[in-house]
Every structure is written in C-alpha cells, then in structure tokens.
Interface confidence: low
Amino acid sequence: TGADTEAVVCVGTACYTAHSGKLSAAEAQNHCNQNGGNLATVKSKEEAQHVQRVLAQLLRREAALTARMSKFWIGLQREKGKCLDPSLPLKGFSWVGGGEDTPYSNWHKELRNSCISKRCVSLLLDLSQPLLPSRLPKWSEGPCGSPGSPGSNIEGFVCKFSFKGMCRPLALGGPGQVTYTTPFQTTSSSLEAVPFASAANVACGEGDKDETQSHYFLCKEKAPDVFDWGSSGPLCVSPKYGCNFNNGGCHQDCFEGGDGSFLCGCRPGFRLLDDLVTCASRNPCSSSPCRGGATCVLGPHGKNYTCRCPQGYQLDSSQLDCVDVDECQDSPCAQECVNTPGGFRCECWVGYEPGGPGEGACQDVDECALGRSPCAQGCTNTDGSFHCSCEEGYVLAGEDGTQCQDVDECVGPGGPLCDSLCFNTQGSFHCGCLPGWVLAPNGVSCTMGPVSLGPPSGPPDEEDKGEKEGSTVPRAATASPTRGPEGTPKATPTTSRPSLSSDAPITSAPLKMLAPSGSPGVWREPSIHHATAASGPQEPAGGDSSVATQNNDGTDGQK
C-alpha cells in the first residue's frame, strides 16, 4: 500500500515527515529516499522531541488509528549476521544514512541476542498515554517486514530531510494564504521554518476572486548561510487593517502612518533586515552563526566574532563549523582504531583483548584457558587464535572443527581390520569370531575351535593388536550364550575370513551375545555392518556388550 504525508515539522536544518501506511522497513526507506531523505534518525533527546512532534501532528489527523499501540519505522537497523553489542547505546544497530554510534537511546525493553536475521527499529507510541514531552516514544526492535506483508502492527514511518539552511515563514500584513511547496514534495500552509529551495505561493485577499493577488517566492541562499525569500516589506498589506492584522506582518514593531500605511521597526539592540520585516540582533553571535557544536565568542567591542570548537573537534574551512579530528591518523592504537565524534577508541582484532603494557594495547586471548575452551578434547592456544585436536581413535568434526567424532575402524579406508567380526567402540574397536571359531592370540584372526556351539568370541585381551593404545573406552567382557546357533559355518582355512554366504546354516537363527557377568541380564540385538562377516555391532559406551545379529530376512542391519 502507498503512504501519504500527513505531517511535517521543520526545525534547525532538517524537516521530519510522518506517514501512515503499512509498509516494510525497506519500502519505507525507499519512500523517503525517492524524495531525497532517509528514515529518520533519533540521535538526541532534542531530535526525539522533533520526531514526537511530527507524530503528534500525524495522530491528530489520523482518526482511523484504533490500535492502542502504534509503531513507526525509523532509520535504525542491524544487518543479518551482525550480532548484538550490549555495551553500545545503539546495541550494534546503525543509522541507515550512515554516521557514528550515537550516545542517545530509548529502548523499550532489553534486547535479545540474535544474529540470524536483519532487525529494524520502530518508535512505539502508546496511544492510551498523552504525547507529553516527558514521555518520548520508545524504541522497539523486531523483524523488518517484507514487501506486501510488513506486519499489521506497523502503522507508518518517519522520514528526515536535511538542508543547507532555512527561510523564516513569510509574514502576511493582511488577509491572505501562503502555500509552501518543499523540495521533498510536501505542501503546507504553516511551517516554523521553510527549507532552502522551497517555493511559496501567496494569495492575498479574503477569498473574493476579484481582489486576489498572487505572489511567488523561492527560498534562496542570499549569502553564505543566509537564506531569504527576496521579498521586500510585509505581504498582502491593506490600509483597511494597518498594523491591526498580524502586527502588520512585522517581526517586532509596527508603526502606522496617518494614511493607513505602516512600516516595520525593531526594538533597541536589533536592526531591520533587507526584507523590511525581520529584526536581527546587533550582537553578531545572536544569529548563532557557529554550527556543529561551535561556540560563538564575541570579539572586542562586540563588533565581530570567532567560533570555538570543543575538544576533539576543529574548525572547518568556513571557520563556522566544527568537524571531528581524526585521531586515528596518528595511529594511537596497537591494532584497530575507530574514530568517534570528538575522540577515538581502540579495538582489538578477533582473538585478542584489551590489555598489556601501554594505552590501546592488545593481548592474546587464551581460548584454551580453563572453563573457556571451545574444543571437545585437545586445545592448543596460538597467537590470536587456537586449534583443536582429538585423541587417537577420534577425528575433528563439526562446522567449526571443535568437536571430535569416533573413527569407525570397522569401515576404515584400508578395509576391515578384523578377519571375521569387527566391533566398533568409542575411540577403539575389537574383533570377534563366528560360532565354532575362536579368536587367535593376535586378536584379529579366527581359528577353528572345538566343535561346540559357542558364542562369537569376545574382545581381545589387553595386549592384543585390536585394542588401541591410550583408549579409555570400557572393554566388553566375553559372554557365554545360553544356546548357540543351529549350525556352524563351513570349514575354511584357519586364517581366512569366513563369508556369510546364503547357504550358511547360521541364517536360521540370530547370533546372540549375553551381557557380561555382573551386568543386568539384558539381551541386545546389534546389527552387522557389511555383507562380509568382517563387521559387527557397535559396542555402546559403558561396557554393555551388544549382540551380533543377522536379520531374519537375510538383510544386514544398519549401524
């Protein structure tokens, strides 16, 4: 939906416009941008008051607003991926038109940390409360809305347009109507200040078409930082009214002649300007010629003035305006220097923190220090960084390489390590054999055992080759079955790997392994990894033996 300008307030060198209309923050910014502005900044209490005034104007005219709470976009946003910074007044948000972090803020509530999506700020107006100056609109952050679906709670937005300067409103000395058209396409008949390059149409008379006179003026820069309409004397003057109508349009005094004519005059200490209407102080500082925080200092005999800047600022080429001194040019910091209005601050690169000898010094952050290590197992601190390592039997894993994942030796790149059954464990593995076979002393091979229906052989002994050095994973105990399988595999050479061929009699019943003695008598049915017997169930951590099974349907289970 579109947005209509409902209200405008011009003050200092800026105009603020308030608009109603349900738009996303991007659409609102685009609307402001089309007319040469941006979503409004609220960089100080004074600016917050100007914005509140324009919203007050809008709400006065917007009878349709029924919601108790109203929200209006301003130009404060945080990009996707940029995280909250609780130490800053703007909490990591920044003004859309650019500019440094500003000290003023008025957050509605504490912000939740989220870096996932773009966040935008709106002014929250509680319409059940009067718009009193002591009750400035709070800042509310949230999703930025999307075109066509901006969220039903956002009622509008506020734009800001900046100008070189302003003209005083035109003064009428008799009945008439002034209509100002601003460079940002707003028309108004009442502005406290009228922005540079605005047009003014003056229709004199009391509405009677025959008597109406029209005048057209443009707000121009007459001299550096001096803006006026180029009009001379009050407009729409009428002998019928003399000084009685709007003080004759005069800024201060109005002096009537006997014939109904009149002249404007000024009080002591003031002088009449070229427009013959406006009075200006004879004190050169009274017109506030100094800008940007500069202080006006009167010269000898009050005849001229100089501008003086606060610490951290210097006069620009005009000698009227203060500009920030870039202290970072002198490289006062060990790593990163951020220039700020009136000063600077030192920052450290990622992996470093403020500290060490000297002002602005940085020292390495020991990421591996007790209680702060990001690594699952081993951590090695380096200058400005760190790296993680894993114990034997584990490899680095995770997106950031801080986690450790068990190596499944039973499916290793070199093929199975066991001749027959292979049992993977956390950080290790062990071998086993099919019924009728026993594990050789090397812990890998299987040899034909006595023709008894025994269970698959359990894990190797401590010195056996299958156990990895340094593993802390509990070992499974050899188990005795209550009954063996109904048949035995075909006779094969003692060192060969017997295959689980389709005619093998073991397919008629599942292989089982009893829980180790001392453990609860629980049957578990692990699955076999591969088509060959050289794989086996993963042994759960904690020492419970799993039971190797071949599925009754002849297919292998999945680990």
Partner: antibody
Amino acid sequence: QVQLQQSGAEVKKPGASVKVSCKASGYTFTSYWMHWVRQAPGQGLEWIGEIDPSASYTYYNQKFKGRVTMTRDKSTSTVYMQLSSLTSEDTAVYYCARSVYYGNKYFDVWGAGTTVTVSS
Amino acid sequence: DIVMTQSPDSLAVSLGERATINCKASQSVDYAGDSYLNWYQQKPGQPPKLLIYAASNLESGVPDRFSGSGSGTDFTLTISSLQAEDVAVYYCQQTNEDPRTFGGGTKVEIK
C-alpha cells in the same frame, strides 16, 4: 473570534450523573485538545482530563477514572463531560479549556464555566 | 503527581509597586531546554486567563508589566508595576506530566 460556550447551571442529587457541554467556535475544532477543569467554591483549580476531538482519544486524571466520560460531536463542534456517582464534593464550577495538540499544553482559551451543585 | 506550591498565599502591594509570586514544583518540569510551567490570572466570577506559558513567554495581548522567570523547580511571576485591574488570584500550572496540576493560588490585593 475563538469562543467556548458552556451549558447552563445544573442541580443534582447525590448518586446522580451530570452531563456538561462545551461548544467551540472560531477555530478548527479538531486541531486542539479540549480539557475539563473544575473549581470547588473558594478552592483552586483541578484538572479532570482531556479529549482529542479529532480521533476521540481521552485521557483522564486517575482521580476521576471510572466516573468521568468525555465525548465529542464533530458535526456540532461540541465536547461533553459526564460525571457520575455525584457527591457533595463534586459541587464546583466546571470549565472547558482548549490546548495545543503537543508539548506544552497550556490552556489559552477557557469557557465561562458551568456551575454544578450536588445537594440532597 | 507533581505538587505545585505557591507562595505567598496572599499579597498586598501598593499601586505602581512590584508584586512577586513564587511557585515551586515537587520535581523538575523542564524538558529539552523548555520549562512546562504556565501562569494564569483569575478575577472573581470569571474563568482563568492565560498570562505566561513556558515559564517566560508572554501570551498575546497580555501587558508587558507581567513577566515570568525560572526553570527546573523554581519559578516566579512578576508584575513590575501593579495596576488596579491586576487584582486577582494567580495560579501556576505544570504541563510536563499527567495529571496536569495547578498551584493553590496567590491572591493579589492593593495595599
């Protein structure tokens, strides 16, 4: 010229309600807030509340909440103030006064006042 | 609520002499460089009339013998040269916070 014309004096019994009117003329009715202020005999001024004639928003002094209702009729540029559950302490002159919309809401134009007497 | 305390309760001044009325707020009524403090004059049988707004701004049509000053919590209304028509009760009022509150009034008479 700007004027606020109030309704005539009222005599009410305790527990009853009174509705006082204030008709605005000489200015744009919806561009100013309308306030109600009362003054008990020999006493000072007490703000009751305000109404925005544009959107009909009302803000009341907590002291009167639940007893006061302010309404407006845009077609006749009239604002009404109704006070219920009257007691003898509500005997006062009730004034309507306008203020600018924002900021320093000083009362630049006042009605002549309506005397409300609560007596059994 | 902000309590507005006026002093004195009554004041008798000779014609042509200066009259000074004080008003003290229980908390500051200043905001962004402005004082949200207004003065009214009430004559017997009439509604109050605005004299001064924002502590020191003279309302249109009010004689310039009336002036206001002060900021924060302490404010003063001065009548530089008392005239017979100035006999009235004067009230201060704050409009910075709800509820809008008035002082108890100061009665000015001719000595």
